[in-house]
Interface confidence: medium
C-alpha cells in the first residue's frame, strides 16, 4: 500500500516538475523572441546570411518561418512526450 502511495506521489511530483520545466522552456523561448531574430535551423552552415540568400526580404521571412517551425517542433516534442506519458500512465490504472 505504501508503495502505491509513493508511486502516486512520485507521479504527481513528476507531473509538477514536467509542467514547471515546460513552462520555463516556453518562457525562455518567448523571451528570446519566438520567430523573432534571423538565423537558420539545423544543417545550416556558418556562412553569413547574406551569402545564403541574396534577397533580404526573402531571408527575413524565410528565417522567421524556420525559427517558428523550430520552436513549434521543440514544443511539440516537449509537450507531446508528456501528453503521451500521461496517456500511458492512465492506461496502466
Amino acid at each position: 500500500r505504501r508503495d502505491v502511495a509513493h508511486g502516486i506521489l512520485n507521479e504527481a511530483y513528476r507531473k509538477v516538475l514536467d509542467q514547471l520545466s515546460a513552462g520555463k522552456h516556453l518562457q525562455s523561448l518567448v523571451a528570446r523572441g519566438v520567430g523573432g531574430s534571423l538565423g537558420g535551423g539545423a544543417g545550416d552552415d556558418a556562412e553569413p546570411l547574406s551569402k545564403r540568400h541574396s534577397d533580404g526580404i526573402f531571408t527575413d521571412s524565410y528565417s522567421r518561418y524556420r525559427k517558428q517551425m523550430a520552436v513549434k517542433k521543440y514544443l511539440a516534442a516537449v509537450l507531446g512526450k508528456r501528453y503521451k506519458q500521461r496517456v500511458k500512465n492512465k492506461g496502466r490504472r
Epitope: R32, G36, L38, G39, V71
Partner: antibody, heavy 115, light 110 residues
Framework: VEESGGRLVTPGTPLTLTCTVS????????MCWVRQAPGKGLEWVGF?????SAYYASWAKGRFTFSKTSTTVDLKIASPTTEDTATYFC??????????????WGPGTLVTVSS | DIVLTQTPASVSAAVGGTVSISCQSS????????LSWFQQKPGQPPKLLIY???TLASGVPSRFEGSGSGTQFTLTISDVQCDDAATYYC??????????FGGGTEVVVK
C-alpha cells in the same frame, strides 16, 4: 553596430548610451549589452528582444533600462556609481533552437564615473 | 547564482603547439549547447569564434575547435599562431534568460 554617448560623468548623473545599427532590422533581431571594466573581464548586462521586451542580468535589474527605436537601442544608467566605469558594448544576439550567438559587435563606448 | 569557471586563467604556448581552455558551468546551459567562445585583443571588441558549443563562426580558422555539452566545455587551439595571442572568454546562455561570461583565459604565445 556602433555605440555612442560614453563620457565622463559624476556619480548619480543619469546617462544614456545609444547603439545604432544598419544592415539588419531590430524588429527581427535581439540586441545585447555587455560591459567591461578597465583591465577586467566581460560582463553581460542584458538584452532587448525583437518584441521590445527587456531582460536584465540579476545584478543589473533596477540599475539599467533598455529601450529602442527602429534603428537604435538605448541603455540608460539611472544613477551611475564608480563601479559602472567600463566600456559598454552592444552586440547582435541571434538564436535558434540549435544555438544562440552574439555575432556582431560594436567597438564599444567608454563610460567613466568619477567625482 | 550560476557560476561559469574558466581554467586556466593564463596559459603560455609555443608557436605550432596546442592549447586547451576549459569552461565549467555550475548548471547546464540552455539546450545543453548554448555555449559560445570569444577572442578579445586589447582595445578591440570580442570576436565570436564558436557558438552552439562546437560550430565554427564564419571566417574562423579550423584550428579552433569547440567541444562539450551540458556543463563542461573545451576550446582547443591547435597549431597555435602568434596572432592567437589574446584573451578568450566562454559565454553560457541559460534557461533562466541569463547569459554569463567565464572569467577569461589569457593566451601568451612564445
Amino acid at each position: 553596430v556602433e555605440e555612442s554617448g560614453g563620457r565622463l560623468v559624476t556619480p548619480g548623473t543619469p546617462l544614456t548610451l545609444t547603439c545604432t545599427v544598419s544592415g539588419f532590422s531590430l524588429s527581427t533581431y535581439n540586441m545585447c549589452w555587455v560591459r567591461q571594466a578597465p583591465g577586467k573581464g566581460l560582463e553581460w548586462v542584458g538584452f532587448i528582444n525583437s518584441d521590445d521586451s527587456a531582460y536584465y542580468a540579476s545584478w543589473a535589474k533596477g540599475r539599467f533600462t533598455f529601450s529602442k527605436t527602429s534603428t537604435t537601442v538605448d541603455l540608460k544608467i539611472a544613477s551611475p556609481t564608480t563601479e559602472d566605469t567600463a566600456t559598454y558594448f552592444c552586440a547582435r544576439y541571434d538564436w535558434d533552437y540549435y544555438y544562440s550567438r552574439l555575432d556582431l559587435w560594436g567597438p564599444g563606448t567608454l563610460v567613466t564615473v568619477s567625482s | 547564482d550560476i557560476v561559469l569557471t574558466q581554467t586556466p586563467a593564463s596559459v603560455s604556448a609555443a608557436v605550432g603547439g596546442t592549447v586547451s581552455i576549459s569552461c565549467q558551468s555550475s548548471e547546464s546551459v540552455y539546450n545543453n549547447n548554448y555555449l559560445s567562445w570569444f577572442q578579445q585583443k586589447p582595445g578591440q571588441p570580442p570576436k565570436l569564434l564558436i557558438y552552439g558549443a562546437s560550430t565554427l563562426a564564419s571566417g574562423v580558422p579550423s584550428r579552433f575547435e569547440g567541444s562539450g555539452s551540458g556543463t563542461q566545455f573545451t576550446l582547443t587551439i591547435s597549431d597555435v599562431q602568434c596572432d592567437d595571442a589574446a584573451t578568450y572568454y566562454c559565454l553560457g546562455d541559460y534557461i533562466i534568460i541569463e547569459n554569463i561570461f567565464g572569467g577569461g583565459t589569457e593566451v601568451v604565445v612564445k
